[in-house]
């Protein structure tokens, strides 16, 4: 299921129109597309151009992150007169052109979405040959990937004075709320660091001091679901070691 956010000021689409009315480049992309991790999403992009009936060589490109300079994730090339845009690049094989560039459509399908795909994407078309021109969406389309929580790491670590602390890291979008439960804890939100810088979908919760032996459970929850994982602490009493 894919949701396309409606921008009321531009009625569904960001329309970038350039040049004089008689001959102009324009690109139409929605501000945002939402889809769930594991699913597929379609990034719509259509364009108009000033080169009437152009049928020369063309290249269609999608890049991620920033316009003009972001890394390419998809590229295809169509020979003069051909409607077939032959894929030259499809990052991890997950990107596929749905539209027909000859018909001014660069729409792209992204398969097997992951949280890492949550970024802005920019479509671009280049004409080569007699006509020599190019144009790229400057605003792009934000792909918003949602995901149920997943606990990526749970561990017990030594801390000063022969004590122990527990860490739980989960990912999800929206970022999940984390709670610890365990001996003499009840339900504790503990110390939550959320989200980690540079890891927008990761949330970490810490139990700074584990005072009792037993099972400690971390629960991650967001609007799409919940996940839990446990860790066990058993200390050899009278010794400085512990078994987890």
């Amino acid at each position: 299921f894919v949701r396309t956010k409606i921008d009321t000021t531009e009625n569904l689409l960001n329309t970038e129109v350039h040049s004089s009315p008689a001959q102009r480049w324009s690109m139409q992309v929605p501000p945002e597309v939402s889809a769930e991790a594991g699913d597929a999403a379609v990034l719509p992009c259509t364009f108009t151009h000033p080169h009437r009936h152009y049928d020369g060589p063309l290249t269609a490109i999608w890049r991620a992150g920033e316009p003009y300079a972001g890394p390419q994730v998809f590229r295809c090339a169509a020979a003069r007169g051909s409607e077939l845009c032959q894929t030259a690049l499809s990052l991890h094989g997950r990107f596929r052109l749905l539209g027909n560039p000859r018909r001014n459509d660069l729409s792209l399908r992204v398969e097997r979405l992951a949280l890492a795909d949550d970024r802005r994407y920019f479509c671009r078309v280049e004409f080569a040959g007699d006509v020599h021109d190019r144009y790229e969406s400057r605003h792009g389309v934000r792909l918003h990937v949602t995901a149920a929580p997943r606990i990526v790491n749970i561990s017990v670590l030594p801390s000063p004075a022969h004590a122990f602390r527990a860490l739980c890291t989960a990912e999800g979008e929206p970022p999940p709320a984390l709670a610890w439960s365990g001996p003499a804890l009840g339900n504790s939100l503990a110390a939550v660091r959320s989200p980690r810088e540079g890891h927008g979908h990761l949330v970490t919760a810490e139990l700074p001091a584990l005072t009792h032996d037993g099972r400690y459970t971390c629960t991650a929850a967001n609007s799409l679901g919940r996940s839990e994982a446990s860790v066990y602490l058993f200390r050899f009493h009278g010794a400085s070691g512990a078994s987890t």
């Epitope: 003009y68 030259a88 020599h132």
Partner: antibody, heavy 118, light 112 residues
Framework: EVQLVESDGGLVQPGRSLKLSCAAS????????LAWVRQAPTKGLEWVAS????????YYRDSVKGRFTISRDNAKSTLSLQMDSLRSEDTATYYC???????????WGQGTLVTVSS | DIVMTQTPLSLSVTPGASASISCRSS???????????VFWYLQKPGRSPRLLIY???NLASGVPDRFRGSGSETDFTLKISRVEAEDVGIYYC?????????FGSGTKLEIK
């Protein structure tokens, strides 16, 4: 770090051929157009040729059309310029450059001197 | 072909002073709003050219903010404030709007 390293040029007689190559590293080679730009001794910069991402489309300045061939090998990250029917006016330092379109000729090689003389 | 005309051909500047180089194109280099295909390069003596400014006014990576590009359509300016000894060399403007891609004839900057 982006690096472009041209092969050695040399002295060649008018009418003869020479092939230049340029080894690239530090970036995703196939994501960019590449170009050759030359500079005659004590003169300014002159664009020679450009090649598209997959080597399908080439552009040349009129004075080298039909004599020069630009090509690329994406598997080896190399750019080439085959120069045939060389003329004395082709004498120049040849630079390979990464052509970023909206970012200009963003990176340049160290240049290699080609002298066409009998 | 688009002709890029640079002025002056050379200029001599006192360290700490500012310098200004003009570039005029024979055709508008404005492709679409916010997208003008004009660039500035510096070639230091015995070295390869280096990109200074892209799309009129954007500073290339590692270029000090003493360099500033401005202009529109057909008239462009590179201004260097607080000129330093390391700024000597030949400055070129160039266009990537149309094939053949062309450069200005260069402006030689010297230090007094």
């Amino acid at each position: 770090e982006v690096q472009l390293v041209e092969s050695d040029g040399g002295l060649v007689q008018p009418g003869r051929s020479l092939k230049l190559s340029c080894a690239a590293s530090g970036f995703t080679f196939s994501d960019y157009y590449l170009a050759w730009v030359r500079q005659a001794p004590t003169k300014g910069l002159e664009w020679v040729a450009s090649v598209s991402y997959d080597g399908i489309t080439n552009y040349y300045r009129d004075s080298v059309k039909g004599r020069f061939t630009i090509s690329r090998d994406n598997a080896k990250s190399t750019l080439s310029l085959q120069m045939d029917s060389l003329r004395s006016e082709d004498t120049a330092t040849y630079y390979c450059a990464r052509q970023d379109w909206e970012g200009g000729f963003a990176y340049w090689g160290q240049g290699t001197l080609v002298t066409v003389s009998s | 072909d688009i002709v890029m005309t640079q002025t002056p051909l050379s200029l001599s500047v006192t360290p700490g002073a500012s310098a200004s180089i003009s570039c005029r194109s024979s055709k508008s280099l404005l492709h679409s709003p916010g997208l003008t295909y004009v660039f500035w390069y510096l070639q230091k003596p015995g070295r390869s050219p280096r990109l200074l400014i892209y799309r009129v006014s954007n500073l290339a990576s590692g270029v000090p903010d003493r360099f500033r590009g401005s202009g529109s359509e057909t008239d462009f300016t590179l201004k260097i404030s607080r000129v330093e000894a390391e700024d000597v060399g030949i400055y070129y403007c160039g266009q990537l709007l149309e094939n053949p891609f062309t450069f200005g004839s260069g402006t030689k900057l010297e230090i007094k």
